[in-house]
């Protein structure tokens, strides 16, 4: 028998520095977690204690904090090289700055293979990107070899900016021939490493013949066997065992997100490359693990540029940006409109001639808007200003919901109106009329939504049975502020870009902004 230790991360999302327990900014260092300096210490401890160790990343290193905003991926290459990762799969967020934003800072600088079998380049890009990412890589590990085959969510064109010269194929269809190729090369231990979410990970384990282990990402899935060490609730045991169509037991793993845990999976193979046993658990990277002092010093050196950036002007406002709770928790506020407009703008993807865009709607809990911005400071808007408005380090995500769920959400928005509660919704691509004289649960008297399958966008009544795409904060997607119906009834959820980054990019693009209160949210009494 031959044992392999797989260490894995996924959806790190720019958390290079240690964070608080909820993966936001570290406040009390003695209780902080994760970060590359701490990860380095743990990885090195395992590498010197165990014989056959692979360190793998399942994508979405890009996007999530000011580190990515400023360094644009150079920080990912630098610190992943320092950690001596063995391989990485491309995630959807690796395309957030376009293909060039992937090629230059990461693909050309990484000292480890970057993989995806289901992304095919065409046209002029094919020769430019050739060899910079690979469908698979055979890695020597001790006296053996292990094949790693990569995959990426085929939804990436709707979630990021890969451009028109990359084709995202079905994962299973693309993986099978690559695995078959590895088999012909006498590679009998094969790991599928990818970024399509837990459901697809399980399907790959079930359907792709020859895959021994699946290491996934995208869905931020936390798996654990035994008593979990922090706040995350396990979605299943670690590893999650799938019985493949050809009768094998295939371990599937994922390690939550944000670098909070290091996935740790031990696999025992027989001489023919069959998995005999698998066990492990994610390791919580808490403060009992010291941060490596050299890596920490390097982080602090790179940090200097971030502090400078946060006070630089992004753009100007010529109007007061009303983000006060007195406005945003009671009525349409122009800060809410600005943020929603930025959210939609960030999700412009012309992927189909029938649609002007794949999504037109935004909802945003008023309680998530934490500060106004005064225009009487020469109109200047800085990252620091936006961090006061959006201090929670969330993301603006893409969900699919039925019209009936949206209706429930808008009823919830005003079910206890007047108490300055955070669930009052700000909107974009939606016209809503409330009648507060009616009883809670029956106050939405008009709900019109902007069409997507149209050449001239216009507002049409919401259809209860239709499925709509909506951009919203991850806080709402996770049922925050009492929006349990969103969490329970959403049909799809893809995590998006850092909230501040979305708004700052929009302001930089627009240069001068002047959002108005324009009748997106109205109140009426009596008949309609």
């Amino acid at each position: 028998a031959w044992e392999l230790t797989i260490l894995h991360t996924n959806d790190v999302h720019s958390r290079l520095e240690q964070t608080s327990e909820d993966s936001s900014k570290c406040v009390n260092a003695s209780r902080c977690m994760g970060g590359v300096a701490r990860l380095f210490t743990k990885v090195q401890q395992i590498r010197r204690a165990e014989p056959n160790v692979l360190l793998l990343d399942a994508g979405d290193q890009y996007q999530g904090t000011i580190w990515f905003t400023v360094y644009k991926g150079a920080e990912v290459a630098h610190f992943m090289n320092a950690l001596r990762y063995d391989a990485m799969a491309l995630g959807n967020h690796e395309f957030d700055n376009g293909v060039e934003g992937l090629i230059e800072p990461l693909l050309k600088e990484a000292k480890f293979p970057i993989l995806s079998a289901n992304i095919k380049a065409k046209g002029p890009l094919a020769s430019q990107i050739s060899g910079l990412y690979l469908p698979y890589k055979v890695l020597p590990v001790g006296d053996e070899v292990v094949g790693i085959v990569g995959y990426t969510s085929k939804e990436t064109p709707f979630l990021s900016n890969p451009g028109t010269n990359l084709v995202f194929e079905d994962e299973i269809t693309a993986l099978q021939p690559e695995v078959d190729k590895l088999k012909t090369l006498n590679v009998n231990k094969i790991i599928a490493l990818g970024h399509s979410g837990f459901e697809m990970d399980k399907l790959i384990a079930q359907k792709v013949r020859g895959v021994d282990v699946v290491v996934g990402g995208h869905s931020n899935t936390f798996l654990y066997t035994g008593n979990p060490p922090s706040k995350e609730v396990p979605a299943g045991k670690y590893p999650f065992i799938v019985t493949s169509d050809d009768g094998r037991k295939v371990p599937v793993v994922q390690a939550y997100a944000f670098g909070k845990y290091l996935g740790y999976l031990k696999i025992e193979f027989d001489e023919r490359g069959n998995v005999i046993s698998s066990h492990g658990n994610p390791i919580l990277l808490n403060s009992s693990i010291p941060e490596d002092p050299s890596i920490k010093a390097d982080i602090n050196k790179w940090r200097i540029k971030l502090d400078n950036y946060s006070t630089q002007e992004l753009g100007k406002t010529i109007v007061y940006l009303d983000g006060s709770s007195q406005s945003c928790r009671f009525r349409e506020c122009n800060m809410g409109n600005l943020i929603c407009d930025a959210m939609i703008n960030n999700n412009l993807r012309h992927t189909d001639e029938m649609f002007w865009n794949h999504v037109s709607m935004c909802i945003l809990n008023g309680g998530g808007i934490r500060s106004p911005i005064d225009e009487r400071n020469n109109g200047t808007i800085t990252w620091e200003n936006l961090a006061a408005v959006l201090p929670f380090g969330g993301t603006f995500d893409l969900v699919q919901l039925k019209g009936s769920t949206l209706k429930k959400a808008f009823e919830h928005s005003v079910h206890r109106y007047g108490q300055s509660t955070g669930e009052f919704l700000q909107v974009g691509g939606i016209h809503v009329v409330y009648d507060l004289s009616r009883k809670p649960g029956d106050r939405v008297v008009k709900l019109d939504v902007l069409c997507t399958k149209c050449r001239v966008p216009s507002y049409d009544p919401l259809k209860m049975d239709e499925v709509y795409k909506v951009i919203l904060p991850n806080f709402l997607a996770n049922g925050g502020d009492g929006f349990q119906m969103i969490k329970d009834e959403l049909l799809r959820h893809d995590s998006g870009d850092q909230d501040i980054n979305v708004v700052s990019t929009y302001i930089s693009k627009m240069k001068v902004i002047y959002p108005a209160v324009e009748g997106r949210i109205k109140f009426s009494t009596g008949s309609h």
Partner: antibody, heavy 117, light 113 residues
Framework: EVQLQQSGPELVKPGASVKISCKAS????????MNWVKQSHGKSLEWIGN????????NYNQKFKGKATLTVDKSSSTASMELRSLTSEDSAVYYC??????????WGQGTTLTVSS | DIVMTQSPSSLTVTAGEKVTMSCKSS????????????LTWYQQKPGQPPKVLIY???TRESGVPDRFTGSGSGTDFTLTISSVQAEDLAVYYC?????????FGGGTNLEIK
């Protein structure tokens, strides 16, 4: 204060087996791998193997595979090493040592094993 | 496995003298990630377990007198005792702490005249 308290000296006959224990205190037992090191009289240090107290996973120096078996009891924070089919070559001082993040931080006081008929 | 070779195997010095001992590894112990050499020096006094003196080739463990200095990089390392004291009578071992499996040098036995 971190301490690794090893069991006392052993005098055993050739062909027999022996089990040496190492009780840990003063730290979280599952945080660090436990190593075992052999030192024959007047000789250098030889790494035998290690065990991960979290899950009982072991790694052995090829030379000691079949000779040594490492186990842990998490409930009592005790690591043990069994040596079997003993010969005079196995006469030595055996140390347990936990490997922290940078080196073998703490060592037991050593257990002297004498194999003699 | 990485082979560690120490020299000399023994040396005898007078108290107050400066002493240097060498350790060579068959492969580099430099971790490119943090630019640290994962080499540890241990001191073993008669009848005692080994005790860490120096880690990362040159970082003195807390409580270790500053007369002990570690240096070197890659495959060649040195332990220097600037002014030997009677209590330094011991065997000094170097260890590869970089990659699996951990391996020790044969030791340098320091005797005091």
């Amino acid at each position: 204060e971190v301490q690794l308290q090893q069991s006392g000296p052993e005098l055993v006959k050739p062909g027999a087996s022996v089990k040496i224990s190492c009780k840990a205190s003063g730290y979280t037992f599952t945080d660090y791998y436990m190593n075992w090191v052999k030192q024959s009289h007047g000789k250098s240090l030889e790494w035998i193997g290690n065990i991960n107290p979290n899950n009982g996973d072991t790694n052995y120096n090829q030379k000691f595979k079949g000779k040594a078996t490492l186990t842990v009891d998490k409930s009592s924070s005790t690591a043990s090493m069994e040596l079997r089919s003993l010969t005079s070559e196995d006469s030595a001082v055996y140390y347990c040592a936990n490997s922290g993040y940078y080196y073998f931080d703490y060592w037991g006081q050593g257990t002297t094993l004498t194999v003699s008929s | 496995d990485i082979v560690m070779t120490q020299s000399p195997s023994s040396l005898t010095v007078t108290a107050g003298e400066k002493v240097t001992m060498s350790c060579k590894s068959s492969q580099s112990l430099l971790n490119s990630g943090n630019q640290k050499n994962y080499l540890t020096w241990y001191q073993q006094k008669p009848g005692q377990p080994p005790k860490v003196l120096i880690y990362w080739a040159s970082t003195r463990e807390s409580g270790v007198p500053d007369r002990f200095t570690g240096s070197g990089s890659g495959t060649d390392f040195t332990l220097t005792i600037s002014s030997v004291q009677a209590e330094d009578l011991a065997v000094y071992y170097c260890q590869n702490d970089y990659s699996y499996p951990p391996t020790f040098g044969g030791g340098t036995n320091l005797e005091i005249k």
